[in-house]
Structures are given as structure tokens and as C-alpha cells.
Amino acid sequence: FGISGRHSITVTTVASAGNIGEDGILSCTFEPDIKLSDIVIQWLKEGVLGLVHEFKEGKDELSEQDEMFRGRTAVFADQVIVGNASLRLKNVQLTDAGTYKCYIITSKGKGNANLEYKTGAFSMPEVNVDYNASSETLRCEAPRWFPQPTVVWASQVDQGANFSEVSNTSFELNSENVTMKVVSVLYNVTINNTYSCMIENDIAKATGDIKVTESEIKRRSHLQLLNSKA
């Protein structure tokens, strides 16, 4: 098909982060077209010669795909017609980090938008009471982080207190020699209090909470990506 008009179409991306070894999504939406056959999606990465992915005439066109992405990319083919050009990236690698461009051609015109994709490792921490310790101790563990994060303890009762003197954090390299297991121990824990173990790097922030009372132990954890913004 040909583009006869002089219009540019709106393309929108969202910065995101990929967890090494897992699947990731590079988000991109555009003004939809009526005919799927009139839509071309091209994903590019700065510094890479070949295409990351190309979708045209209703199917993948991978003849110009760069070898570093071979077998690792897919668009949501059934959602292209409604303006979803997002890319699924399988088995995210550290080297996938960088600037990507989502380039769209339709019968209405063309448009493109860039997105920054960060890669690293992040996981939920779990906080437990360490019954093997000589004193009341909490142990915070998270299996996979990269780059090396910071670990900070906080407590509901002693708000603003600095626990660095009564805690010890270690980082153990995992078998794939990139990510690390995070272990932090908090000593001199008092009962009837809620403690938080906060793990953070430039990609994600995760918190593990534990509430210790005479009768029960309650745990809660959550993880937030730091760079997801439009």
C-alpha cells in the first residue's frame, strides 16, 4: 500500500523494566486502522543494525530481524487491529537494556515513539523470625536482584530510627553469575511491632513487612517498578 496523505499518527510508549531471564513487555499503542493489512509495526533498538521485530500485512516479517532477538519477540497479533503494537520479549537479557523505537505505518500515516527499557533483576522479599538466633532476630531474604540493591530496615514503633547498627546485609552471587541473593538480618527485635525490610535499586523497590505479636506473625510484601512512566 502507499501513503498518500501527509498525516502523522499518534504513537504512545511507556518506559518499562525487564526482569532478567523472564519475559518482558515493551508497551506501544497507536491510532488504529480499519484494515490489518495496512498496518506495519517496526521495533528498532538504538545501536542495533537489524530490526527487533517487524509485523506487516497481518503477519510477522522477520527477514531483517537482528540475530540478538531471533526467536525472542512477538507482537499481540489479535490486538494490532485495535492499536496495540506492544512487543513481548522472551528471556530478557541484561543487554536488552537501551532505547527502543516503536515505528508505525498505516493508511492514515506514520508515527513513532521511543522508550527506555531497563533490565535487571528484582524479586519479592520474605521476612521471617530467625528462631535459630540467640536473640530475637528477623531474617529478610530476596532470591534475585541486580544491580546490587540497598537494604533498609524500618519499624512502626520506632519511626525514623536507624537500624544500620543492628542489622547485617549480605549479597550472594547466584549460579548464573549475574543476579544475587539478598539476605539481611535485623537483631534485637521487640515484640508487638511491625518491621519493614526495604530493598531498592534503580529499577525496583520491594518491601517485606512482618508484624510480630505474642499470638501471631503476619507477613506482607509488595514490589514496585521505579521507572514505569508515560
Epitope: 500500500f1 502507499g2 501513503i3 498518500s4 502523522s8 506495519v40 528498532l44 538504538e46 545501536g47 542495533v48 543494525l49 537489524g50 531483517e64 537482528d66 540475530e67 540478538m68 543487554t95 537501551g98 523505537k101 515505528y103 505505518i105 506514520k110 513513532n112
Partner: antibody
Amino acid sequence: EVQLVESGGGVVQPGRSLRLSCAASGFTYSSRAMNWVRQAPGKGLEWVSAISGSGSNAYYADSVKGRFTISRDNSKNTLYLQMNSLRAEDTAVYYCARKRWYGMDVWGQGTTVTVSS
Amino acid sequence: SYELTQPPSVSVAPGKTARITCGGNNIGSKSVHWYQQKPGQAPVLVVYDDSDRPSGIPERFSGSNSGNTATLTISRVEAGDEADYYCQVWDRGMIFGTGTKLTVL
């Protein structure tokens, strides 16, 4: 300031070899693909070769394929063009240029290669 | 292989508008870039992605691209705009147009 400075040009006999260098500064060199572009005397621009940021992938114009090799040393922020089996028609000013998506946003000042017996 | 055709020369009076065309099969579906080259100097990017301007390039330079023709428009032409202009697309390599010499009368 982003800068590209070519060197290594000169006069060489047909069939001989020459290696051009391009020193890059002012940007994260390893994250950008790079190009060599040439311009014969009184002629237009002709793309020669491109290399990915990591150096793992390269493309060549048909006119130089099998004779020229593009490479890079990211630890030295330097781009190279090894030119073998040189011909008279390879006489040109050779520019290195930083690739930006589908185009080139920064160019060096060029280095002159003359192939003559 | 993909070919881009430009007129060899375009002449324009100072203060007027110059239009330089770049023809290619369905070029409207490609991203077109324009370079200015003055004698003895390296090319300079003046328009990228059809119509965007790099920082430092005057607003007088604009571009459009549709169908089989991309156009570089220079409004209020100045003597300093006299140069060779090249269009360029990517097609498994950089493809340059034949070049247009802009003469300011």
C-alpha cells in the same frame, strides 16, 4: 561535545591495503551503531558499511563486500575500516558517521584516500 | 535495490522558497533524512524522520513525505543555504539520493 575524527587516509597503489580510524568522543560510544560513508571527487555520497554498537553485526555495500571490513574497539572509542584490494574507484573522502535510527546525526570531517599507481 | 532520484540543480532568489524533491518507490512508507553539504565540508543533518529538525537547524528548513515523493522545503532562502542537499533512507544500508545543488541567485 560530540566529535568524530577520522585518520589513516593517504595515497596507496591499486591492490594494496589501508586502515582508516575514527576516534569518537562526547557520547556513549558502545551504545551507538556507526557508519562509513564515502564521496568520490565531484560525486555524491555513497554508504560503505555499518556496524552495531556491540560490534557483533555489520552490513556492507555491494561495491566493497569481501574487500572492506568494518570493526570497532569500544574500550578505545574507535571505529575502523580495513580496506584491502584497493581500486582506483575507491578514491574518495571517507567519513565516519554515527547512526541514529534510520539516519546519521553526527559526521566526522573526513579523511582522503587516493588509489593511484 | 532501492533508488532515490533528485533533480541535479535548483535555483532560487534570496528570500524566496526552495523545494528539493526526492523520488522513490512508495517512499512515503519510509523515514527520510536530509543532509546539507557545503564545499569542502562534511554533510550536516538538517531534517530527520521526514519532517523533524535537529537542534540548531533554523525553522526555515522543513520536510514532508508522501506517496512517491519526499520534499525538503527551505523558506526565506539565504545566501548561506547554497550547498548540495542529499536525501537518504535506510534499506538494509544507507541509501542516498543523487544530490541536488541549490544555487541562490
